[in-house]
């Protein structure tokens, strides 16, 4: 139950991608507007996204802080223009979201190949090493400080002129493959965390083939 | 409970050719890489091939390239090895396992296909 | 192609003894190395992964070791339940490949 006219928000969502996370929900508001709070399992409340008309607030912030904490957030729902009313229990009108642990769960972006290079019969495949939001001594992240060596990179690969894949693994930002001299091969990449039960896999990275801008050849 | 059950295995004449089927129960193919493993009689392990079922990359060993192709349907939650122009050397037991990009976690229990006139 | 080389292909030993099984890649593999058990008539089982970690569930007596192209698998002390066949499997670049298989055979 709450004040006349004000609906409690639903379908609390984290949407997360390289620890950039927001918070959506529903519904739209008529009437009405919002505030969200977000805290660790043992923390204090802390308040964003005061009063809004938006369903979404951005809460990267907050859980940039400590990627391995779990954090639980709740939307607080208020009549438009009379923030202070209250729901007959006398408490704001509000709805928890699920719990949200960035580390486990924050989605893998789709990553990109950065160059690669031939030297005889092997290529040297970089991976851009993406910068994140989380920071540590003042300095921002990349993907690999964060996740280490529970982050792979799986490595397809294929003769430009033949459709049979194969494929490699790193822990690296960076793959070691043996080619045919004379041939062209194209690329592409996607990261994986093998110890996660769920968003394992990113998508694909875009493809990369030799004899375009990204690579270099030495005899 | 994670499960992996094979089926289609069976008795085939040279040159013929047979689907096997992988079913998978307790999560979801997408979110893992499929392999197909063999074992001939009394033979070690052989490393057929893999599927991503989310975006359906296949890697095979050149071996079979040309003759066995593995695909999914992630609706039904299964992986499939499609086997032509069988020979008596395919005559194995083929194993199906889910692959957490570090290890082979999760094995079916195996189908046997026999190849013979 | 990488090889995986396995040895030794059987051995014979009694309940409690230290039992110890390598496999040496062809070339450099980094840690993409894991250990399964097979007993007759089963499937494959996972036991040692990914620079030595083992499966929850798998007893602390198998543990492995190895990195690059030379890789062990250890039984601290045998149980009755261990006879078997163990093989190694490269899983860092296709074809993956397995060891020949070890059989540990009861003494």
């Known amino acids: 139950s709450g004040t006349t006219n004000t609906v409690a928000a639903y379908n609390l969502t984290w949407k997360s991608t390289n620890f950039k996370t927001i918070l959506e929900w529903e519904p739209k508001p008529v009437n009405q507007v919002y505030t969200v709070q977000i805290s660790t399992k043992s923390g204090d409340w802390k308040s964003k996204c005061f009063y809004t008309t938006d369903t979404e607030c951005d809460l990267t912030d907050e859980i940039v802080k400590d990627v391995k904490q779990t954090y639980l957030a709740r939307v607080f729902s208020y009549p438009a223009g009379n923030v202070e009313s209250t729901g007959s229990a006398g408490e704001p009108l509000y709805e928890n979201s699920p719990e949200f642990t960035p580390y486990l769960e924050t989605n893998l972006g789709q990553p990109t190949i950065q160059s690669f290079e031939q030297v005889g019969t092997k290529v040297n495949v970089t991976v851009e090493d993406e910068r994140t939001l989380v920071r540590r001594n003042n300095t921002f992240l990349s993907l690999r400080d964060v996740f280490g060596k529970d982050l792979i990179y799986t490595l397809y690969y294929w003769k430009s002129s033949s459709s049979g894949k194969k494929t490699a693994k790193t822990n690296t930002n960076e793959f070691l493959i043996d080619v045919d001299k004379g041939e062209n091969y194209c690329f592409s990449v996607q990261a994986v965390i093998p110890s996660r039960t769920v968003n394992r896999k990113s998508t694909d990275s875009p493809v990369e083939c030799m004899g375009q801008e990204k690579g270099e050849f030495r005899e | 409970e994670v499960q992996l059950v094979e089926s289609g295995g069976g008795l085939v004449q040279p040159g013929g050719s047979l689907r096997l089927s992988c079913a998978a129960s307790?999560?979801?193919?997408?979110?893992?890489?499929m392999h197909w493993v063999r074992q001939a009689p009394g033979k070690g392990l052989e490393w057929v091939g893999w599927?991503?079922?989310?975006?359906?990359?296949?890697i095979y060993d050149p071996k079979f390239q040309d003759r066995f192709t593995i695909s999914a349907d992630t609706s039904k939650n299964t992986a499939y090895l499609q086997m032509n122009s069988l020979r008596a050397e395919d005559t194995a037991v083929y194993y199906c396992?889910?692959?957490?990009?570090?290890?082979?976690?999760?094995w079916g229990q195996g189908t046997l296909v026999t190849v013979s006139s | 192609d990488i090889q995986m080389t396995q040895s030794p292909s059987s051995l014979s030993a009694s309940v409690g003894d230290r039992v110890t099984i390598t496999c040496k890649a062809s070339?450099?593999?980094?840690?993409?190395l894991s250990w399964y058990q097979q007993k007759p008539g089963k499937a494959p089982k996972l036991l040692i992964y990914?620079?030595?970690s083992g499966k929850r569930g798998v007893p602390s007596r198998f543990s492995g070791s190895g990195s690059g192209t030379d890789f062990t698998l250890t039984i601290s002390s045998l149980q009755p339940e261990d006879f078997a066949t163990y093989y190694c499997?490269?899983?860092?670049?296709?074809?993956?490949?397995f060891g020949q298989g070890t059989k540990v055979e009861i003494k």
């Open positions: 307790g999560f979801n193919i997408k979110d893992y890489y």
């Open positions: 499997l490269q899983h860092g670049e296709s074809p993956f490949t």
């Open positions: 396992a889910r692959d957490t990009a570090a290890y082979f976690d999760y």
């Open positions: 070339r450099d593999i980094k840690s993409y």
């Open positions: 990914y620079e030595g």
């Open positions: 599927i991503d079922p989310e975006n359906g990359n296949t």
